[in-house]
Interface confidence: low
Amino acid sequence: QPSVSPGEPSPPSIHPGKSDLIVRVGDEIRLLCTDPGFVKWTFEILDETNENKQNEWITEKAEATNTGKYTCTNKHGLSNSIYVFVRDPAKLFLVDRSLYGKEDNDTLVRCPLTDPEVTNYSLKGCQGKPLPKDLRFIPDPKAGIMIKSVKRAYHRLCLHCSVDQEGKSVLSEKFILKVRPAFKAVPVVSVSKASYLLREGEEFTVTCTIKDVSSSVYSTWKRENSQTKLQEKYNSWHHGDFNYERQATLTISSARVNDSGVFMCYANNTFGSANVTTTLEVVDKGFINIFPMINTTVFVNDGENVDLIVEYEAFPKPEHQQWIYMNRTFTDKWEDYPKSENESNIRYVSELHLTRLKGTEGGTYTFLVSNSDVNAAIAFNVYVNTKPEILTYDRLVNGMLQCVAAGFPEPTIDWYFCPGTEQRCSASVLPVDVQTLNSSGPPFGKLVVQSSIDSSAFKHNGTVECKAYNDVGKTSAYFNFAFKGNNKEQIHPHTLFTP
């Protein structure tokens, strides 16, 4: 019994003055609580509690179920307890068969004894099966048997509490251990699609899959930078004991532009959290954006190839694509394909392959694309670089020598005089007149240049060279002169091509 210090409240005293009391079934239990400030007796066993406001607790005919802890409390909140065992050979165990254990924690098999003097209080497997080798337990006659550090492998384990009575093993009712797994990793979360592009009024629906060891994983859809509660629907499945799957589906039945944003599926358990996001973009109507992959002004040499390439974004999907030149539509020589096979792809590529281009094939090449909402186009200006061609070279009636050349870029015409029989014409002659003429062909075609010199300046036999050149190449034409007396005669001109 507790000792009393004067002036300080003391706990009540109980008669009989021992911590444990053993009585036989059918005997009387008589417990007396002595305290000037007595408040109540409390009886506890398993989940049962009873109270008594009398300072003497009397049970005339004790039963096994009267086994338990009797506590007397005074007005200062101080208490004292006695534990009573009611020995009943026919009922050695009091039992609460609910048995849940959290993985890695201890759990109590609740089978307190009615007789503390039996021996070998332990656990046994059902139907004679051995317990798992690593199962450790600590028996306590007043509480039951504590299983230490519950393992996931113990789930659905069937067991009995057991004692030896008069040389025989006596088993309690059976217990089935249900293990609640510990979270040893963050939940696994995935989303049906990483991004969505919709037009106003279309339905937005996205599903998040959450996987974990048990259904106590928490999950929610959140909108980034918003506290608004989102409407979600759940489906869930248990694939075996520790393999739980939940699908959380978020739906906006008629999406609006201001619904655009990032939506996060967040899940957490006691180990940690995980999240995955999906992006929603809602547009008021469809769109097409075209991006040229090469310069829209293209220079290509005569006889060479060029590829005109565009990338374009189209939403909804493109329905018509075409390449046009001089009001004619290409039926071949081009291809159009999606940039990726991803179902949410909106980016496409179109390529027009122009081969062995001629000087007459320069011009505007146009790509047109349309979907159900919009049309779009882009034009490429193609210039074909051609070596100069001398169209005419004549001696005019006024004594002028005239050379007309065509090519692209615009040719330059230089004049040279070669006296006598010299092969190389190096003395340059300044032209009297140079004009760029309008070509009768299409724009982007060859440019025509006319240059003239005065032949009266030549006093000796020789050759006059008209040389036309540009970045691509050069071409020459020659005028031969011979003097008979005082008369100058033109011998037929001829051309010499110089690449």
């Epitope: 040893k184 957490n268 940690g272």
Partner: antibody, heavy 122, light 106 residues
């Protein structure tokens, strides 16, 4: 009673090695993150390293990376810190600490050992 | 890395005083801040976690507040056993401690 007891400290020359141990009792050691935190003489606390419950992930203070290795043996309820290439600035009391969590992957140290002293001096 | 700065580094106070210690993070750490108490020759002891949650067994005169980068530990009425050094610690990215605040008897 939940308890952490460190051992293995001592005097070592610069460039030398030491292995610290921490024995855990009174709790399910295999279910907790564990850490080493040190305190140089007259200075504040400095987190050194930690390890997740199965031992598959480790994190280190930049200045000890490549020199220190944290490990654990769940069967023996033990945490270790292997310290190589020791420097004078590693002189400190080394505490073993248990990491507990609140909510998500946010940790605090709720149980500490009494510490073991490491002195690096020539 | 996230740096933690505590102020003041030391203060003198009397029993019964209200004491406030501040801790500033070099970048936002949400509410991921803990406070520890350490007495000479002893291991640190967790007082408060997640900015304001009192660890089991810690007297209610200790309280914490703040969020983002600025945090405060308050002792509403200083008791003789509260004279010690106090450390803040962030748990947002890896782990780092403040330099400590020593609370001495005036």
């Amino acid at each position: 009673e939940v308890q952490l007891v460190e051992s293995g400290g001592g005097l070592v020359q610069p460039g030398g090695s030491l292995r610290l141990s921490c024995a855990a009792s009174g709790f399910a050691f295999s279910g907790y993150y564990m850490a080493w935190v040190r305190q140089a003489p007259g200075k504040g606390l400095e987190w050194v390293a930690n390890i997740n419950y199965p031992g598959s992930s480790t994190y280190y203070l930049d200045s000890v990376k490549g020199r220190f290795t944290i490990s654990r043996d769940n069967a023996k309820n033990s945490l270790y810190l292997q310290m190589n290439s020791l420097r004078a600035e590693d002189t400190a009391v080394y505490y073993c600490a248990r990491g507990d969590y609140y909510g998500t992957t946010y940790w605090y140290f709720d149980v500490w050992g009494q510490g073991t002293t490491v002195t690096v001096s020539s | 890395d996230i740096q933690m700065t505590q102020s003041p580094s030391s203060l003198s106070a009397s029993v019964g005083d209200r004491v406030t210690i501040t801790c500033r993070a070099s970048q936002s750490i949400s509410s991921y801040l803990n406070w520890y108490q350490q007495k000479p020759g002893k291991a640190p002891k967790l007082l408060i976690y997640y900015t304001s949650r009192l660890q089991s067994g810690v007297p209610s005169r200790f309280s914490g507040s703040g969020s983002g980068t600025d945090f405060t530990l308050t002792i509403s009425s200083l008791q003789p056993e509260d004279f010690a050094t106090y450390y803040c610690q962030q748990g947002r990215r890896l782990w780092s401690f403040g330099g400590g605040t020593k609370v001495e008897i005036k």
